[in-house]
């Protein structure tokens, strides 16, 4: 054997964020020499599942007919060829939404904001939670976490944006979660449309407030600025 077998590719269809009760298919793609595929779930000592390869043997399907809390988590897959087991795939994080009631998302002072001004998106939950996520539709890296420190639970999290540019415009939703499982999220909030009206000059975000301009604005993570307003909440970039 020249070296370790190449690691397979692991992905989920229709995606890795699945609403409670919906179906999801996990795919593991290896090589044509594969004889068996194995799916492991973090903290599960036995192989989580195993399947024969589908013809032409380079991938296997693991079906979840109805998403529940038990399926949420971190997965890796392997394949076995005549010379042994492959390296593990990169992890797949399967997240379930619908574990808790939906939070409310609002914009302060208003969802209609002038370019160059400030706006704060406020995500509020009915019950205390310790993680809040803000998601922008059609962003390649949509998740921004605000997570409480020391397990302190909050009813809300603020996501400040300043100065606002046209990049910030779009549709947002937020989720809330408990720290004991980052794979279980609330139902999504109702969408909030943030409308950025133009000014004579759109201020260009400083390098510390944005990322490289190599990609278009929709490919960038949302990067609000300023200090975290809620004591006990820390910002985490995904």
């Amino acid at each position: 054997q020249a070296g370790p077998l190449p690691k397979p590719t692991l992905w989920a269809e229709p995606g890795s964020v699945i609403s409670w009760g919906n179906s999801v298919t996990i795919w593991c793609q290896g090589t044509l020499e594969a004889r068996e595929y194995r799916l492991d779930k973090e903290e599960s000592p036995a192989p989580w599942d195993r399947q024969n390869p589908l013809e032409p043997k380079n991938k296997a399907r693991f079906s979840i007919p109805s998403m529940t809390e038990d399926y949420a988590g971190r997965y890796r897959c392997y394949y076995r060829s005549p010379v042994g087991w492959s390296q593990p795939s990169d992890p797949l994080e399967l997240v379930m939404t619908g574990a808790y009631s939906k939070p409310t998302l609002s914009a302060l002072p208003s969802p209609l904001v002038t370019s160059g001004k400030s706006v704060t998106l406020l995500c509020q939950s009915r019950s205390p939670m310790d993680t809040f996520l803000l998601i922008k539709e059609r962003a390649a890296h949509p998740l921004l976490h605000l997570r409480s420190e020391h397990g302190a639970q909050q009813h809300q999290a603020e996501f400040p944006m300043s100065p606002v540019t046209s990049v910030h415009g779009g549709t947002y939703r937020c989720f809330s979660s408990h720290g004991f499982s980052h794979y279980l999220l609330s139902h999504p909030s109702d969408p909030l449309e943030l409308i950025v009206s133009g000014s004579l000059e759109d201020p260009r975000p400083s390098p510390t407030r944005s990322v490289s301009t190599a990609a278009g604005p929709e490919d960038q993570p949302l990067m609000p600025t300023g200090s975290v307003p809620h004591s006990g909440l820390r910002r985490h970039w995904e």
Epitope: R35, K41, A46, P47, R50, N52, G84
Partner: antibody
Framework: QVQLVQSGAEVKKPGASVKVSCKAS????????MHWVRQAPGQGLEWIGE????????NYNEKFKTRATLTVDTSTSTAYMELSSLRSEDTAVYYC?????????????????WGQGTLVTVSS | DIQMTQSPSSLSASVGDRVTITCRAS??????LNWYQQKPGGAVKLLIY???RLHSGVPSRFSGSGSGTDYTFTISSLQPEDIATYFC?????????FGGGTKVEIK
């Protein structure tokens, strides 16, 4: 020590169903898959299917897919095999057997402990 | 499904004899071959896994070898307590399949 204790012999009529139990002890039940295998009188061993007690995932022999149902009760560390629409050729000894990793290296898996077997007789 | 052909179906040997059983798979099983012992009462025990690895507590007189499609199980010195039926089983692909068994008796 690892023990798999199965339920007693059963006599069933054609068309009926049978449910065989297998109580595990001496190890962590959810750490090992459970296999079910049968042996007709004077015949070899035939694999029915397997179940992962930690999540209920199952794989079946195509031959038994429509008639066999494997379940577990993790609270009592018990596995069950139900076979429906019984016919005379289902008369056999049914075994549960633990499947897991052997040795230190990745990938060596085998059935390492077996139950004592349950005789199911199908007769009109 | 992979077919496993085991031979002989039965044999009779004297205490102390060397006993050999063969198992042939219908396709390459990459050494994923296990051997089991079934005593007359029905109890089944794993003896050898992955062609040649001795399961814990199994006497060293039992051994296995082979590769590809052809595998061999050997008892180097037959003992009275070895009276049993021996089965090979492939674990290369689902479903696992078994050989027809070899019944070993004492002359």
């Amino acid at each position: 020590q690892v023990q798999l204790v199965q339920s007693g012999a059963e006599v069933k009529k054609p068309g009926a169903s049978v449910k065989v139990s297998c109580k595990a002890s001496g190890y962590t039940f959810t750490n090992y898959w459970m296999h079910w295998v049968r042996q007709a009188p004077g015949q070899g061993l035939e694999w029915i299917g397997e179940i992962n007690p930690s999540n209920g995932r199952t794989n079946y022999n195509e031959k038994f897919k429509t008639r066999a149902t494997l379940t577990v009760d993790t609270s009592t560390s018990t596995a069950y095999m139900e076979l429906s629409s019984l016919r005379s050729e289902d008369t056999a000894v049914y075994y549960c057997a633990r499947w897991g990793q052997l040795g230190l290296r990745e990938g060596y898996y085998a059935v390492d402990y077996w139950g004592q077997g349950t005789l199911v007789t199908v007769s009109s | 499904d992979i077919q496993m052909t085991q031979s002989p179906s039965s044999l009779s040997a004297s205490v102390g004899d060397r006993v050999t059983i063969t198992c042939r798979a219908s396709q390459d099983i990459s050494n994923y071959l296990n051997w089991y012992q079934q005593k007359p009462g029905g109890a089944v025990k794993l003896l050898i896994y992955y062609t040649s690895r001795l399961h814990s507590g199994v006497p060293s007189r039992f051994s296995g070898s082979g590769s590809g499609t052809d595998y061999t199980f050997t008892i180097s010195s037959l003992q009275p307590e070895d009276i049993a039926t021996y089965f090979c089983q492939q674990g290369n692909t689902l479903p696992p399949t078994f050989g027809g068994g070899t019944k070993v008796e004492i002359k």
